[in-house]
């Protein structure tokens, strides 16, 4: 079963994952004017075991205008752990192994990728919230949401975060950016959907849980 809804929307805040649990899907989306290659992957899948997790199936986009004549073969998840790459990309480095066991890092971008990434998360996945530029956190509660399974149904926990304009109020004494916390153990392996819009996330999993949870590069 997959999460019936998206993580909660918090006004003036965005969310993202620090790492992705095994079973997470990332749809292969192409930007306008491009499409998935025929007989190419439909989505990437975080797969592996407790000691090593990686993204299987590389997304590839081709121009909608030109006919795709070259036959492309999807890399085999089992036998072929070294990814095939498109001609214009350098071979993929093994950056997709997350520090957290059973998790994958943010997948590297692919050529002509859409500006929006659509993820399908598994139960136990945590997403973290941060106020957008020009806003700051008003309440210091947990700024995360977890996809949980309760009585056979999936739900997202409600993050305790309120974002307010910088001009409206000053930061509360002692207030700081929310820190990453270890993810809860899953109750079952079911998936949830999340979209990350308007920017390409290139966030590395924090080497320790002491650093700020957001290191987003805008491309």
């Amino acid at each position: 079963e997959l999460c019936d809804d998206d993580p909660p929307e918090i006004p003036h805040a965005t969310f993202k994952a620090m790492a992705y649990k095994e079973g997470t899907m990332l749809n292969c989306e192409c930007k306008r004017g491009f499409r998935r290659i025929k007989s190419g992957s439909l989505y990437m899948l975080c797969t592996g075991n407790s000691s090593h997790s990686s993204w299987d199936n590389q997304c590839q986009c081709t121009s909608s205008a030109t006919r795709n004549t070259t036959k492309q073969v999807t890399p085999q998840p089992e036998e072929q752990k070294e990814r095939k790459t498109t001609e214009m990309q350098s071979p993929m480095q093994p950056v997709d192994q997350a520090s957290l066991p059973g998790h994958c890092r943010e997948p590297p971008p692919w050529e002509n990728e859409a500006t929006e990434r659509i993820y399908h998360f598994v139960v136990g996945q945590m997403v973290y919230y941060q106020c957008v530029q020009g806003y700051r956190a008003l309440h210091r509660g947990p700024a995360e949401s977890v996809c949980k399974m309760t009585h056979g149904k999936t739900r997202w926990t409600q993050p305790q975060l309120i974002c307010t304009g910088e001009m409206e109020t000053s930061q509360f004494p002692g207030e700081e950016k929310p820190q990453a916390s270890p993810e809860g153990r899953p109750e079952s392996e079911t998936s949830c959907l999340v979209t990350t819009t308007d920017f390409q996330i290139q966030t590395e999993m924090a080497a320790t849980m002491e650093t700020s949870i957001f290191t987003t590069e805008y491309q």
Partner: antibody, heavy 118, light 110 residues
Framework: QVQLVQSGAEVKKPGESLKISCKGS????????IGWVRQMPGKGLEWMGI????????RYSPSFQGQVTISADKSISTAYLQWSSLKASDTAMYYC???????????WGRGTMVTVSS | QSALTQPASVSASPGQSITISCTGT?????????VSWYQQLSGKPPKLILY???KRPSGISDRFSGSKSGNTASLTISGLQADDEADYYC??????????FGGGTQLTVL
């Protein structure tokens, strides 16, 4: 509740056209691929094709390429399977199914029975 | 593309275990871990019971297990119950980004 609701049974004559539907609800239906599967009376399952409602990207089984058309209208979360000229051999139950994680079809519609007879 | 090969029927008594094989090629079953199994009760749509060769969706009994060796996948049902009587289908994702189903196996609980 996550579900796929298919249109009702159809009885048609050979040569007629037909379009059956599959509406997704209870989930973000434009971001999951929807497949179509045929089951002829007393026979097994046959994969026909799949569509991504978000951008209408479609893949067909070689056996069904050119025989049917798969389409979608993402504004109403609906996928379609259509024939321009039905044959008696198209008589079957047609299921739509959502593609979940690990390339498995996790949610299935109840099926649409299509009967083609003169 | 040819259907995956399954035995047409198997039968066993309650409490026993049965195994259904599913043989494909190096372009489907042998190429990926993306093998799934479906149970179809009479007059009902198929239901996913195993994916990724051996993983169970929530709500599926641990009496259902799966494995794969080379181009052949297997479904094992232990502690057979009367309500396991159904048709079982294997399916595999293929190298050409299509899917193929097995011909189906009718399980009879004696």
């Amino acid at each position: 509740q996550v579900q796929l609701v298919q249109s009702g049974a159809e009885v048609k004559k050979p040569g007629e056209s037909l379009k059956i539907s599959c509406k997704g609800s209870g989930y973000s239906s434009t971001s999951y691929w929807i497949g179509w599967v045929r089951q002829m009376p007393g026979k097994g399952l046959e994969w026909m094709g799949i569509i991504y409602p978000g951008d209408s990207d479609t893949r067909y089984s070689p056996s069904f390429q050119g025989q049917v058309t798969i389409s979608a209208d993402k504004s109403i979360s609906t996928a379609y399977l259509q024939w321009s000229s039905l044959k008696a051999s198209d008589t079957a139950m047609y299921y739509c199914a959502r593609l979940g994680s690990a390339y498995a079809f996790d949610i299935w519609g109840r099926g649409t029975m299509v009967t083609v007879s003169s | 593309q040819s259907a995956l090969t399954q035995p047409a029927s198997v039968s066993a008594s309650p409490g026993q275990s049965i195994t259904i094989s599913c043989t494909g090629t190096s372009s489907d079953v042998g190429a990926y871990i993306y093998v799934s199994w479906y149970q179809q009760l009479s007059g009902k749509p198929p239901k996913l019971i195993l994916y990724d060769v051996s993983k169970r969706p929530s709500g599926i009994s641990d009496r259902f297990s799966g494995s794969k060796s080379g181009n052949t996948a297997s479904l094992t049902i232990s502690g057979l119950q009367a309500d396991d009587e159904a048709d079982y289908y294997c399916s595999s994702y293929t190298r050409s980004s299509t899917w193929v189903f097995g011909g189906g196996t009718q399980l009879t609980v004696l």
